[in-house]
Each structure stands twice: as structure tokens, then as C-alpha cells.
């Protein structure tokens, strides 16, 4: 028995070949012997049943001269899954058609971090097929009647080429995924005390009309609990602020990409934020983490202090040195001090490996004089 795979809504071609490789009489039937179509010697396609009943069934007349009498079934339905019989040259050939339906749950437009389940459904009780989907960038996901893709990323967007294999027979279909998300899952901003701060949250997708709502929660390093800094709505890509904290005095841009500014980087603002964006007609939320590291350099009485506040990595090094001189102190910690610093220009650097994340300079006028 020959097996043919077909996807619901598409077309399938069931083969039937003459050993003579020339035109001959043939009949296609259902397994219950009802006639579908055939050719009875005059080169004319004869259909069985009423036209409306069999209007999806056809053959390739152009192939008959070569001894090929395929049955074409268009707009495949799940109930087309059955055995079809081709009668010719006093023999019968059975062809098994397996029609499958593909469903995507929750859909092909998803949010970053969500999962997609691809399910093959069929009326026939076939053994497990192999389903394999390959992204144009090379990523491959495989399964059987159920294929799962978890923790989707923006990079997983675009066209996937999927093949269903059963008994060495293949059928392919495509799916286009659209994974909505921020360009970066996390970002970090380094600022000296008093500098202006800008946070940008660019989306990794473009849509003509984008509607939803969002909020930025902030966990300051020095605070015991997080605080909602701003809530906003998004309507047709226009941002409107609904509620904003009075400290800090935040401003938010009215158009995309989402953008926030603080007039000053202050130690009490150093910490981590989580911007969430809920999009209309989508379950779940998009998230982007943002971190603010603030550097403060001050001279108090007889001590020069450099301190960084906010989420730094343990590999980061804080260095305090006089400009154009060797480092006086350099430690993997968040505060460094020099007692009785010499007069002149001092520099504090926050670095990771050989990369300087930020630096701040201070003029030490004389020992024992406050200068920030």
C-alpha cells in the first residue's frame, strides 16, 4: 500500500502507474467501491456521483499518455484520510492518504519568553510521524505529533520550513513566527552623580498600530521595597503618561521607542528597574530590565572617597588615582578611599577587565578642605 501525506486545505496527488507506460482504462474508487473518476477508453475524464460531490477530485490528463493516472484531491479535508483504490490493467492499487491539520497554540504571533506548541491532528490512527521545523538561521526543532518551542526569542521570528515524515514519505509546510519583544532583555546605564540619565526601550518589531499599557517599577539599592515610577498607555504608537512619581521628576517621550529621562543621577536612584509592557490582544507581558549605576566622588575632611552604587558585577574594579600617575587604590569593591590625598586632579575609574565603564574627576585643592 502506497502512503501519501497531505495538509488540510492543500492538494494531494495519489499515484497510479501503468506498466505499459501508455494510456489505458483506469478507475479511481473509494474503499467502499464508490466510483470517483476514471477514463473508459475515449480519453475523456468521467466523474462519478454528482458534480458538487466530486468537484475537488481531478486527474492530470497530460500525464495519461505516459501511463500515469494520478488522483488529485484539492482543498483537502480531514475526512479525506482513507484508502483509495486505483483499478487498471486487471489489477488494483491501494493508496493510503493521511491528511493532517496543523494548529499553533497560542498562535504564530507571540511575546518574547512565551512558548509555542505545534500540533498535528488527523482522523487516521497513524504511527508517530516525525515533525521537524528549521529556521532560516539554522535552528532546528523536532517532535512527533506535538512539537514544542519554549522560551521564544525575538531572533526566532521569521519563516520556518517544517517537514512531516511518515514511512519515508515527506510533506512540508511553512510557518511565519512573529516574536514580539524588546531589542535587549537587559541594559545598564553608568552615570556620574548629577548627570542626566536617559533610558531607552527599543522594540525589536514594527507594527503599524501598537496599543497597550506599561509600567516601570524601580528597586533602588538603598530602598527596602520597589516603587512604581511611571505608568503609561500606548495607543497607535503614541505614549501618554497616566501616573508618574514626583521623586524623581521623570519625563517620558510621547513617541516610540519608549524613552525616559531623569534630570539627575543621584545615589538614591541607583538600582534596577523592570519595564513591563502589556499589548492589546496579547496574553502576557513584555519585560525589559534596566540598571542604573551611579558614581560619587567626594572629599570630606582628610579623605577622598569614590563610591559606586547600583548593580555592579563582582569582576568590576574601582580605581582611585592622581591623573597621569599610578593607581593609589584599586579594588574589586564598591568604595575606595585615599586618606590625606595630594593636591591636584584625581580620577576614579570603574572598569571591567580592560574596559572602562565610567570615570569621574575631582580637583583636590588642599588637604582637609571639602570639595565635591
Amino acid at each position: 500500500k502506497t502512503l501519501v501525506l497531505g495538509k488540510e486545505g492543500e492538494s494531494a496527488e495519489l499515484p497510479c502507474e501503468s506498466s505499459q507506460k501508455k494510456i489505458t482504462v483506469f478507475t479511481w474508487k473509494f474503499s467502499d467501491q464508490r466510483k470517483i473518476l476514471g477514463q473508459h477508453g475515449k480519453g475523456v475524464l468521467i466523474r462519478g456521483g454528482s458534480p458538487s460531490q466530486f468537484d475537488r477530485f481531478d486527474s492530470k490528463k497530460g500525464a495519461w499518455e505516459k501511463g500515469s493516472f494520478p488522483l488529485i484531491i484539492n482543498k483537502l479535508k480531514m475526512e479525506d484520510s482513507q484508502t483509495y483504490i486505483c483499478e487498471l490493467e486487471n489489477r488494483k492499487e491501494e493508496v493510503e492518504l493521511w491528511v493532517f491539520k496543523v494548529t499553533f497554540s497560542p498562535g504564530t504571533s507571540l511575546l518574547q519568553g512565551q512558548s509555542l506548541t505545534l500540533t498535528l491532528d488527523s482522523n487516521s490512527k497513524v504511527s508517530n510521524p516525525l515533525t521537524e521545523c528549521k529556521h532560516k538561521k539554522g535552528k532546528v526543532v523536532s517532535g512527533s505529533k506535538v512539537l514544542s518551542m519554549s522560551n521564544l526569542r525575538v531572533q526566532d521570528s521569521d519563516f520556518w520550513n517544517c517537514t512531516v515524515t511518515l514511512d519515508q514519505k515527506k510533506n512540508w509546510f511553512g510557518m511565519t513566527l512573529s516574536v514580539l519583544g524588546f531589542q535587549k532583555a537587559s541594559s545598564i546605564v553608568y552615570k556620574k552623580e548629577g548627570e542626566q540619565v536617559e533610558f531607552s526601550f527599543p522594540l525589536a518589531f514594527t507594527v503599524e498600530k501598537l496599543t497597550g499599557s506599561g509600567e516601570l517599577w524601580w528597586q533602588a539599592e538603598r530602598a527596602s521595597s520597589s516603587k512604581s515610577w511611571i505608568t503609561f498607555d500606548l495607543k497607535n504608537k503614541e505614549v501618554s503618561v497616566k501616573r508618574v512619581t514626583q521623586d524623581p521628576k521623570l519625563q517620558m517621550g510621547k513617541k516610540l521607542p519608549l524613552h525616559l529621562t531623569l534630570p539627575q543621577a543621584l545615589p538614591q536612584y541607583a538600582g534596577s528597574g523592570n519595564l513591563t509592557l502589556a499589548l492589546e490582544a496579547k496574553t502576557g507581558k513584555l519585560h525589559q530590565e534596566v540598571n542604573l549605576v551611579v558614581m560619587k566622588v567626594a572629599q570630606l575632611n582628610n579623605t577622598l572617597t569614590c563610591e559606586v552604587m547600583g548593580p555592579t558585577s563582582p569582576k568590576m574594579r574601582l580605581t582611585l588615582k592622581q591623573e597621569n600617575q599610578e593607581a593609589r587604590v584599586s579594588e574589586e569593591q564598591k568604595v575606595v578611599q585615599v586618606v590625606a590625598p595630594e593636591t591636584g586632579l584625581w580620577q576614579c575609574l570603574l572598569s571591567e577587565g580592560d574596559k572602562v565603564k565610567m570615570d569621574s574627576r575631582i580637583q583636590v585643592l588642599s588637604r582637609g578642605v571639602n570639595q565635591t
Epitope: E198, K235, E238, S240, Q251, G253, K254, K255, T261, P263
Partner: antibody
Framework: EVELLESGGGLVQPGGSLRLSCAAS????????MSWVRQAPGKGLEWVSG????????YYADSVKGRFTITSDNSKNTLYLQMNSLRAEDTAVYYC????????????WGKGTTVTVSS | AIQMTQSPSSLSASVGDRVTITCRAS??????LGWYQQKPGKAPKVLIY???SLQSGVPSRFSGSRSGTDFTLTISSLQPEDFATYYC?????????FGQGTKLEIK
């Protein structure tokens, strides 16, 4: 070609009301954000009020908040500014301006209508 | 509200001169700033949008630039028709705010 034409200006006593209109032609009104900008005699430009393309969000300068109301009627392609509790300092030429679709800048302006608040 | 500080308030120059006008924003406003020209008795018209994009139909002698929160309008070679008042406008967020204006006069 997009054109904006303001009307409704005139002389009004302090405490009085006036409604300005801005009729737009040559554009799909609901697509664009719109603003009212004024200029007192011999002074600079002052942004007064704005409305989003959908008409759902309205915005005001602190100087007019609670006294002025911006609305739009998409079926008539018209923008309105209802001005109540008028003061002498509201005396100005009032311009309506259309914003770009992808940019916020005001790319089309009307010729203006003069409002004088005086007893 | 975001404050826009424009300078100078007035400027005398001659035809052919290179002129710069600056605006400073009290907050970061990305590139969301436009430059407008106004002549007496007329409505303003946009010259530059998004800090440095030249509006269609505006002569190329007008240019805009940004450095942080400082924005500059430059007229490379003044023409007689350029004598007017110039305003910057931040359209980053509501309420929008204009600079105080710069009156450019013939020397």
C-alpha cells in the same frame, strides 16, 4: 494640499467664553495629532493644547488647564478650542497646527485667529 | 514641564554671515526638537525637525545639530529673506514648550 483655517476669534470680556474652530482640508483628520499655539502681541510662541489623533488623549499648558478644552470632530474634520473664564493674558493670535504622522513636529499651520480679552 | 532656554534673544548680522542659535533642554529629549521661522504677521513654518532633518522645500543653508541636551540651528550664509524670528520647540513630551525666540535683524 493640506490647509487649516481658524475661526471664532473676537473681542470678549474677562470671565467670558469663546470657541475657536479649525477646519482642515486635504487630510484624514483622525490620523494626526493636532495642537493649538498662541502668540500674545509682541511676545513669543506658546503651546496651549494638544489632542491625539484618536481624540482620546488631550493635553494642556499649565496656564490654561481647567479653563480650556480641546476637542475634535473627525466627521467634520474640525478641531475646537473651548475657552472659558478668559483673562486679559489670554489675548493673542491663536494658531492651529497639524503634526506629522511619524514625527511630532508641526508641519502645517493655519493663518491664525485673533482673540482679544478686554473690558 | 521641560524648560527650553534659547539664546541669544536677538542677533544682528549681515547678508552672507554664518549664524548659530542654540537651545538647551532642562531634560534629555532625544532628538525631539524642531526649529521654526516666523515673519511678522505670518504663521510659523518648520525648518528643521528631529533636531537635524531638513523639512522639504527648506534651503540647505539651514541645518540643525544636537549635543546631549544642547541643540543648534545654523544658517551657513544669511540671505535677505532669512531675517525673521526663530523658535525651537521640544516635542518630546507634553506639555510642548517653545524657546523664548531669537530675533535675527539686519546689521
Amino acid at each position: 494640499e493640506v490647509e487649516l483655517l481658524e475661526s471664532g476669534g473676537g473681542l470678549v470680556q474677562p470671565g467670558g467664553s469663546l470657541r475657536l474652530s479649525c477646519a482642515a482640508s486635504g487630510l484624514t483628520f483622525s490620523t494626526f495629532a493636532m495642537s493649538w499655539v498662541r502668540q500674545a502681541p509682541g511676545k513669543g510662541l506658546e503651546w496651549v493644547s494638544g489632542i491625539s489623533g484618536s481624540g482620546e488623549n488631550t493635553y494642556y499648558a499649565d496656564s490654561v488647564k481647567g479653563r480650556f478644552t480641546i476637542t475634535s470632530d473627525n466627521s467634520k474634520n474640525t478641531l475646537y478650542l473651548q475657552m472659558n473664564s478668559l483673562r486679559a493674558e489670554d489675548t493673542a493670535v491663536y494658531y492651529c497646527a497639524k503634526e506629522g504622522y511619524n514625527w511630532n513636529y508641526m508641519d502645517v499651520w493655519g493663518k491664525g485667529t485673533t482673540v482679544t480679552v478686554s473690558s | 514641564a521641560i524648560q527650553m532656554t534659547q539664546s541669544p534673544s536677538s542677533l544682528s548680522a549681515s547678508v552672507g554671515d554664518r549664524v548659530t542659535i542654540t537651545c538647551r533642554a532642562s531634560h534629555g529629549i532625544r532628538n525631539d526638537l524642531g526649529w521654526y521661522q516666523q515673519k511678522p504677521g505670518k504663521a510659523p513654518k518648520v525648518l528643521i525637525y528631529e533636531a537635524s532633518s531638513l523639512q522639504s522645500g527648506v534651503p540647505s543653508r539651514f541645518s540643525g545639530s544636537r549635543s546631549g541636551t544642547d541643540f543648534t540651528l545654523t544658517i551657513s550664509s544669511l540671505q535677505p529673506e532669512d531675517f525673521a524670528t526663530y523658535y525651537c520647540l521640544q516635542d518630546y513630551t507634553y506639555p510642548y514648550t517653545f524657546g523664548q525666540g531669537t530675533k535675527l535683524e539686519i546689521k
